[in-house]
Amino acid sequence: QFLKEGQLAAGTCEIVTLDRCCNKNRRTIARQTARCACRKGQIAGTTRARPACVDARIIKTKQWCDMLPCLEGEGCDLLINRSGWTCTQPGGRIKTTTVS
């Protein structure tokens, strides 16, 4: 079973676009688009700060921290209304991700 050019292996993702803009109040806003080939029961998400295929039920329930979206050693917390999550580094710096 050989992959055709441009075809992703099942269960993997690749970053398609990464836009950084609008450095407001010392905050950089980044928008990332990924292309994923997910297995049955999975959906595109984020694991260890990279695009990944995750359990589809995580997306349905908006339990974003169940994707393990933060880097190892960072703390994950849900935003109010489960609109996204924050990753808190050991030094206290917080990275916020909102889902759209």
């Epitope: 292996a9 099942a10 269960g11 297995r39 049955k40 029961g41 694991t47 260890r48 995580i58 339990q63 921290c65 169940d66 393990l68 933060c70 190892e72 050693g73 960072e74 703390g75 994950c76």
Partner: antibody, heavy 113, light 107 residues
Framework: QSLEESGGRLVTPGTPLTLTCTAS????????MNWVRQAPGKGLEWIGI?????TTYYAGWAKGRFTISKTSTTVDLKITSPTSEDTATYFC??????????WGPGTLVTVSL | ELDLTQTPPSLSASVGGTVTINCLAS??????LAWYQQKPGKPPTLLIS???NLESGVPPRFSGSGSGTDYTLTIGGVQAEDAATYFC?????????FGAGTNVEIK
């Protein structure tokens, strides 16, 4: 980074037993935590998994027989009503992508009259 | 539910020889397969994930291959310390499943 199981002992059939898994060197909330068992001289059997939120999934044969729960520092496995078939070494193991990169040394549970 | 058939159940190999262990899945698992080594009285240790990705610290004589439903663990230039039981594990979906194991004896 390591895992250690505790709580294994000789129990009589029907007496509930809780096993505990303690992590060192990493946060349990950054991983999916699993319980796997191995009967003497037999193969490995996956029992179930717990997510950071507390969501659990079990093998079909394990539903109703086992309960996985967690605190901020430990993951527990309750054997609700042990039978002789539950005599085994119980391992906790961590995963991110579905394979187990760190295992505890295991704790032996013997179910006998 | 996924079923993994591991063959052979046991084998004997000579130091320096090659060992091949097969794992047949009951359905396509899209390369979501891992291999473990287990020695008596010890927990399993991860050798290979994603069919062919060697874990850090694992000797390069271990290799994995396969796709779809057929997967293979190969130990080239077998050493005495490779005597152990080897398990395959599929993780394409729940429940996570193990093969029955292959006991490798070194002559």
């Amino acid at each position: 980074q390591s895992l250690e199981e505790s709580g294994g002992r000789l129990v009589t059939p029907g007496t509930p037993l809780t096993l505990t898994c303690t992590a060192s060197g990493f946060s349990l909330s950054s991983y999916y935590m699993n319980w796997v068992r191995q009967a003497p001289g037999k193969g490995l059997e996956w029992i179930g998994i717990i997510y950071p939120s507390g969501t659990t999934y079990y093998a079909g044969w394990a539903k109703g027989r086992f309960t996985i729960s967690k605190t901020s520092t430990t993951v527990d496995l309750k054997i609700t009503s042990p039978t002789s078939e539950d005599t085994a070494t119980y391992f906790c193991a961590r995963t991110v992508s579905g394979y187990f990169d760190i295992w505890g040394p295991g704790t032996l549970v013997t179910v006998s009259l | 539910e996924l079923d993994l058939t591991q063959t052979p159940p046991s084998l004997s190999a000579s130091v320096g020889g090659t060992v091949t262990i097969n794992c047949l899945a009951s359905e396509d698992i899209y390369s979501a397969l891992a291999w473990y080594q287990q020695k008596p009285g010890k927990p399993p240790t991860l050798l290979i994930s994603g069919t062919s990705n060697l874990e850090s610290g694992v000797p390069p004589r271990f290799s994995g291959s396969g796709s779809g439903t057929d997967y293979t663990l190969t130990i080239g230039g077998v050493q005495a310390e490779d005597a152990a039981t080897y398990f395959c594990q599929g993780y394409s979906s729940y429940p996570l499943t193990f093969g029955a194991g292959t006991n490798v004896e070194i002559k």
